[in-house]
Interface confidence: low
């Protein structure tokens, strides 16, 4: 059957798109790469806005392969520096804490779901 | 081919500012980092900070920080360097470089340089 | 910052000869998520601006000739030119851009008896 626009903005596709394109630094071309900084920056400013973190929350950084992890592994990074709770300077107010995973010091929410609630009123 | 064009050239009065040029060819101008560069005799090179023109972040060697501005106008391509309060250390060449593949940090490409002399 | 710490400050050599100038590090400029070190070495010929001759330590620019090899990881850094030409005569530079801001040796001038 056709798709719909409505299959298109589904948490997969946002997904997929994450994994594959943030912070992804080894692309095969420059038009690939100037994609990868687009999505990249888009999910920093999404999840520094909606304070946010991945497309279901900072379980995405841990359960798939990406090339997030590719480029930062586990132990320095779990999630990006934007799941951290930030100072008015948009600092992590304790970027220790917020890789320890230390409630309160980053967010748990998918970004997703903040996305997807106002679209899906229309 | 990847250009970046500088004047060869800038004579200017201490205490007063100045704007560097470099006009970007060749290549999707929003596409890559522009970084800019000092060089002086003795010092050697002095990487003065970087703007993304796609959206004008910067950063600034905190050295710097109060001396230049970086900027962009996209729609003729061209980077901007503004450095300000000239004093005579700050007679140098200045170079525009642009990034490598994409967020590739090594400078890629280089301007000529251009020469700013402060002298009264 | 990171300081670049380059050796010897100049060298003179013989055309045929081997070259081997060092670049040392404050800090390691190892991505230990890519496993990249994030250090380039740059050329500067007379009267030009720098060109760049090897990224991520070891990887050469398109162009640059295979007598240029660089080689070294974490905070040691090696530059050698295997077979030097004349057309070497040059400052080389090494940098650091694994963090802002990103900072330069102070460069190694080579000259050619």
């Known amino acids: 059957t056709a798709a719909t626009q409505q299959d298109f903005f589904t948490p997969n596709l946002f997904l997929k798109q994450m994994l594959e394109r943030y912070q992804n630094n080894s692309p095969p071309n420059n038009d690939d790469q100037w994609k990868n900084n687009g999505v990249t920056k888009t999910w920093d400013r999404l999840m520094l806005q909606d304070n946010c973190c991945g497309v279901n929350g900072p379980s995405d950084w841990q359960k798939y392969t990406s090339a997030f992890r590719t480029e930062n592994n586990d132990a320095d990074y779990p999630w990006p520096r934007q799941c951290c709770v930030m100072n008015n300077l948009k600092e992590p107010l304790n970027l220790e804490a917020c890789k320890l995973g230390v409630p309160g010091f980053y967010h748990n929410q998918g970004c997703y779901e903040l996305i997807s609630g106002p679209m899906n009123r229309h | 081919q990847v250009q970046l064009q500088q004047p060869g050239a800038e004579l200017v009065r201490p205490g007063s500012s100045v704007k560097v040029s470099c006009k970007a060819s060749g290549y999707t101008f929003s596409s890559y980092w522009m970084h800019w560069v000092k060089q002086r005799p003795i010092q050697g090179l002095e990487w003065i900070g970087n703007i993304d023109p796609s959206d004008s972040e910067t950063h600034y060697n905190q050295k710097f920080k109060d001396k230049a501005t970086l900027t962009v106008d996209k729609s003729s391509s061209t980077a901007y360097m503004q450095l300000s309060s000239l004093t005579s250390e700050d007679s140098a060449v200045y170079y525009c470089?642009?990034?490598?593949?994409?967020?590739?940090?090594?400078?890629?490409?280089w301007g000529q340089g251009t020469l700013v002399t402060v002298s009264a | 910052d990171i300081v670049m710490t380059q050796s010897p400050s100049s060298l003179t050599v013989t055309a045929g000869e081997k070259v081997t100038m060092t670049c040392k590090s404050s800090?390691?400029?190892?991505?230990?998520?890519?496993?990249?070190?994030?250090l380039t070495w740059y050329q500067q010929k007379p009267g030009q601006p720098p060109n760049p001759l090897i990224y991520w330590a070891s990887t050469r620019e398109s162009g640059v000739p295979d007598r240029f090899t660089g080689s070294g990881s974490g905070t040691d850094f090696t530059l050698t030119i295997s077979s030097v030409q004349a057309e070497d005569l040059a400052v080389y530079y090494c940098q650091n851009d694994y963090s802002y801001p990103f900072t330069f040796g102070s460069g190694t001038k080579l000259e050619i008896k």
């Open positions: 470089a642009r990034s490598g593949a994409g967020t590739g940090p090594w400078l890629a490409y």
């Open positions: 800090q390691s400029l190892l991505n230990s998520g890519n496993q990249k070190n994030y």
